[in-house]
């Protein structure tokens, strides 16, 4: 009886199980009883990242810097090329089609994990005894002033967006 | 035990036609794919045509193709080749061959084909 | 086609020798090659399968190497009944092709 299934890296076809291209390679003929599959590699500018039976390669992906795009990895006749974001922006998605300014995190909050190309500005809001006072991608929140050591003493509480105010002690009070 | 007997050669004129058979006997004949190939004398060897296997394509040379027509007949358990517009580039002895994973693991002994005036 | 072509055509070597040929195909054909052993008057006979797979019943004594373009068949010791013409066969392109063929005679 001629096969119903084939092996792993095979495809049927006219009751004969036939051998899948490689990757980067594009099918040109199917096999025969006499014959292998024939198989032709991927231009430069193109892919194939599976075993396969396609008759045409994928192009690799365009990194447009006009969408503030760059090539992070060149492809290859097996992986499609890899972008990435130009510096300060970062991918709108996965596939990273296109990128957006990194987000700054407003006084009050801090910056939790800096942007990459791929992912954008995480922020935080500066916990009791830290403060942010500007709108920043970079900035972490900063601890208040610690008047005590400086031999001051507090003469304005510190909020989430401003530094303590240190003053001298009152020498009245000693 | 496998044996492969060919038969139907003989000599022909230029122009005509032969019919050659192949008696197949000792595994089961549909299940294989079939082939011709045939060695000029003093020359090597020539793919000349082949069939699949359950009533599979035919396959033929460039330089037989449109003259030479390959069958086979399950039931009879044998392959033919019919051959029309003989020419003298076409002697040779023909042998017919079982294919296995693309190679002829089982060939017949031959049958001399000669095209001459 | 896919022109094979084989070398040396022909060679003298005597019993006991080390004995290789050489077949290179026009273009790639991956492992896809056979080679066939062929005495006077005899059919051929199948002896090596996708380049380096030794076909059932044939000595230790003969192997198969290469990929791509070119490939050697190899008899490690000559015996007095290897005296034959070999042919290599190439499947991976429509239609299959034989070289020239390698004649080994008695030195």
């Known amino acids: 009886e001629p096969p119903t299934a084939c092996r792993e890296k095979q495809y049927l076809i006219n009751s004969q199980c036939c051998s899948l291209c490689q990757p980067g390679q594009k099918l040109v003929s199917d096999c025969t009883e006499f014959t292998e599959t024939e198989c032709l590699p991927c231009s430069e500018s193109e892919f194939l990242d599976t075993w396969n039976r396609e008759t045409r390669c994928h192009q690799h992906k365009y990194c447009d810097p006009n969408l503030g795009l760059q090539v992070q990895q060149k492809g290859t006749s097996e992986t499609d090329t890899i972008c990435t974001c130009e510096e300060g922006l970062h991918c709108t998605s996965e596939s990273c089609e296109s990128c957006v300014p990194h987000r700054s995190c407003l006084p009050g909050f801090g910056v939790k994990q800096i942007a990459t190309g791929v992912s954008d500005t995480i922020c935080e809001p500066c916990p009791v005894g830290f403060f942010s006072n500007v709108s920043s991608a970079f900035e972490k929140c900063r601890p208040w002033t610690s008047c005590e050591t400086k031999d001051l003493v507090v003469q304005q509480a510190g909020t989430n967006k401003t530094d303590v105010v240190c003053g001298p002690q009152d020498r009245q009070r000693a | 035990e496998v044996q492969l007997l060919e038969s139907g050669g003989g000599l022909v004129q230029p122009g005509g036609s032969l019919r050659l058979s192949c008696a197949a006997s000792g595994f089961t004949f549909s299940s294989y794919a079939m082939s011709w190939v045939r060695q000029a004398p003093g020359k090597g060897l020539e793919w000349v045509s082949g069939?699949?296997?359950?009533?599979?394509?035919?396959y033929y040379a460039d330089s037989v193709k449109g003259r030479f027509t390959i069958s086979r007949d399950n039931s009879k358990n044998t392959l033919y080749l019919q051959m029309n517009s003989l020419r003298a580039e076409d002697t040779a002895v023909y042998y017919c061959?079982?294919?296995?994973?693309?190679?002829?693991?089982?060939w017949g002994q031959g049958t001399l084909v000669t095209v001459s005036s | 086609d896919i022109q094979m072509t084989q070398s040396p055509s022909s060679l003298s070597a005597s019993v006991g020798d080390r004995v290789t040929i050489t077949c290179r195909a026009s273009?790639?054909?991956?492992?896809?090659l056979n080679w066939y052993q062929q005495k006077p008057g005899k059919a051929p006979k199948l002896l090596i399968y996708a380049a380096s797979s030794l076909q059932s019943g044939v000595p230790s004594r003969f192997s198969g190497s290469g990929s791509g373009t070119d490939f050697t068949l190899t008899i490690s010791s000559l015996q007095p009944e290897d005296f034959a013409t070999y042919y290599c066969q190439q499947y991976g392109r429509n239609p299959p092709t034989f070289g020239q063929g390698t004649k080994l005679e008695i030195k």
């Open positions: 061959a079982r294919y296995v994973n693309f190679g002829m693991d089982y």
């Open positions: 273009q790639s054909i991956s492992s896809y």
């Open positions: 069939i699949g296997s359950y009533g599979g394509g035919t």
